[in-house]
C-alpha cells in the first residue's frame, strides 16, 4: 500500500533572467527512493538515481543544475519556462509518486511590482 505523500513548493513565480529551485519532498513512507525524474510538460529535464547520480538532459545542461538534494535549479529563466514541472519519485517497494509544481516566469518589472503587494 502506498502511504507516502509528496510535498512540493506548489505554485511559484520568478523573474525572467533569474533562477529558481524546484523542490519536492516525499514523506510518510519508509520506502527507499531509487530514482527521481524531473519533467517539464513532456520533456525529461533531469534524473537523479541512487546508484548513478545525476543525469541532466543535454539540451538543458546550460540552464539546469542538480540540487540542492533531490531538487533542481533552473537558471537564466525565460518566459518560455512558464508551465508545469513534475517530480516523479520511483520508490521501493511502494512504486511511483508524482508531485506537481507550476512555475510562472514574469518580466522583471511585473515580478517586482507583484512583490510589493504580497501578503505576508
Amino acid at each position: 500500500m502506498m502511504t507516502g505523500t509528496i510535498e512540493t513548493t506548489g505554485n511559484i513565480s520568478a523573474e525572467k533572467g533569474g533562477s529558481i529551485i524546484l523542490q519536492c519532498h516525499l514523506s510518510s513512507t519508509t520506502a527507499q527512493v531509487t530514482q527521481v525524474n524531473w519533467e517539464q510538460q513532456d520533456q525529461l529535464l533531469a534524473i537523479c538515481n541512487a546508484d548513478l547520480g545525476w543525469h541532466i538532459s543535454p539540451s538543458f545542461k546550460d540552464r539546469v543544475a542538480p540540487g540542492p538534494g533531490l531538487g533542481l535549479t533552473l537558471q537564466s529563466l525565460t518566459v518560455n519556462d512558464t508551465g508545469e514541472y513534475f517530480c516523479i519519485y520511483h520508490t521501493y517497494p511502494d512504486g511511483t509518486y508524482t508531485g506537481r509544481i507550476f512555475l510562472e516566469v514574469l518580466e522583471s518589472s511585473v515580478a517586482e511590482h507583484g512583490a510589493r503587494f504580497q501578503i505576508p
Partner: antibody, heavy 118, light 107 residues
Framework: EVQLLESGGGLVQPGGSLRLSCAAS????????MNWVRQAPGKGLEWVAG????????YYADSVKGRFTISRDNSKNTLYLQMNSLRAEDTAVYYC???????????WGQGTLVTVSS | DIQMTQSPSSLSASVGDRVTITCRAS??????LNWYQQKPGKAPKLLIY???SLQSGVPSRFSGSGSGTDFTLTISSLQPEDFATYYC?????????FGGGTKVEIK
C-alpha cells in the same frame, strides 16, 4: 571499455530448459538495471525481461511470464535468464543490454542464438 | 501495453538524402522514446535517447524530436554506413516495447 558477453544459447527441444548468462565488464555492474531483448529470425526486437539495480525488482513480457526468470549476481558481474518450458516461438537471438536510469539501453552484447526445435 | 507504430516499414534513399522516420505511441509517453540502429548480424546501437538527446559518439546528422505520442528520427544527409534498420522504443512503462522497424535501403 564496457563489454557484455552472452553465452548459453544452443539447440533445445520444445518443453526443455536453458540458462543464458551475460558477463559484464568495464563498469560498475551493480549500479545498472539490465535487460534481455530477443530477436526472432528476420523479425524485430522484443523486450523479454528487466531487473532493476537498487531494488532488484524484476519485470517480464507477457509472452514469457511464468516461464522465464531473470536474475543477477553482482559479485560475479553476471546477468542470467533461466528459460523453462521453451516453445518454438522462443527461437531467437537473445541480447543482454545495460539500462542506465531505466530510460535507455546504451550497451548491448553480441547476442546468443537459442533454437527450439525437435 | 503501449503499442509503438513506426512508419514507413521500409524506404529507399540515396546518399546525401534527408531521411525522416516517424514513430507513434498508443498513449502519451512524455519523452521516454529511444532510437536504435541495427545492421544485419549485429547488435542494436543506441542513437537517440529521451526523444532528442544524441548518444555519445553518434554523428550529429542524426537527430530526434517529438514528445507525447509523436516522434521523429531524422538523418540530415544519408551516408553509406547509415543503410540499416531503425527501431524506436518506449521506456515510459513496462513492458518496454519497440516499433516494428524501418529498413533504409539504397535506391
Amino acid at each position: 571499455e564496457v563489454q557484455l558477453l552472452e553465452s548459453g544459447g544452443g539447440l533445445v527441444q520444445p518443453g526443455g530448459s536453458l540458462r543464458l548468462s551475460c558477463a559484464a565488464s568495464g563498469f560498475t555492474f551493480s549500479s545498472y538495471s539490465m535487460n534481455w531483448v530477443r530477436q526472432a529470425p528476420g523479425k524485430g526486437l522484443e523486450w523479454v525481461a528487466g531487473i532493476k539495480s537498487s531494488s532488484g525488482n524484476k519485470y517480464y513480457a507477457d509472452s514469457v511470464k511464468g516461464r522465464f526468470t531473470i536474475s543477477r549476481d553482482n559479485s560475479k558481474n553476471t546477468l542470467y535468464l533461466q528459460m523453462n518450458s521453451l516453445r518454438a516461438e522462443d527461437t531467437a537471438v537473445y541480447y543482454c543490454a545495460r539500462g542506465p536510469y531505466d530510460v535507455w539501453m546504451d550497451y548491448w552484447g553480441q547476442g546468443t542464438l537459442v533454437t527450439v526445435s525437435s | 501495453d503501449i503499442q509503438m507504430t513506426q512508419s514507413p516499414s521500409s524506404l529507399s534513399a540515396s546518399v546525401g538524402d534527408r531521411v525522416t522516420i516517424t514513430c507513434r505511441a498508443s498513449q502519451s509517453i512524455s519523452s521516454y522514446l529511444n532510437w536504435y540502429q541495427q545492421k544485419p548480424g549485429k547488435a542494436p546501437k543506441l542513437l537517440i535517447y529521451a526523444a532528442s538527446s544524441l548518444q555519445s559518439g553518434v554523428p550529429s546528422r542524426f537527430s530526434g524530436s517529438g514528445s507525447g505520442t509523436d516522434f521523429t528520427l531524422t538523418i540530415s544527409s544519408l551516408q553509406p554506413e547509415d543503410f540499416a534498420t531503425y527501431y524506436c522504443q518506449q521506456s515510459y512503462s513496462t513492458p518496454l516495447t519497440f516499433g516494428g522497424g524501418t529498413k533504409v535501403e539504397i535506391k
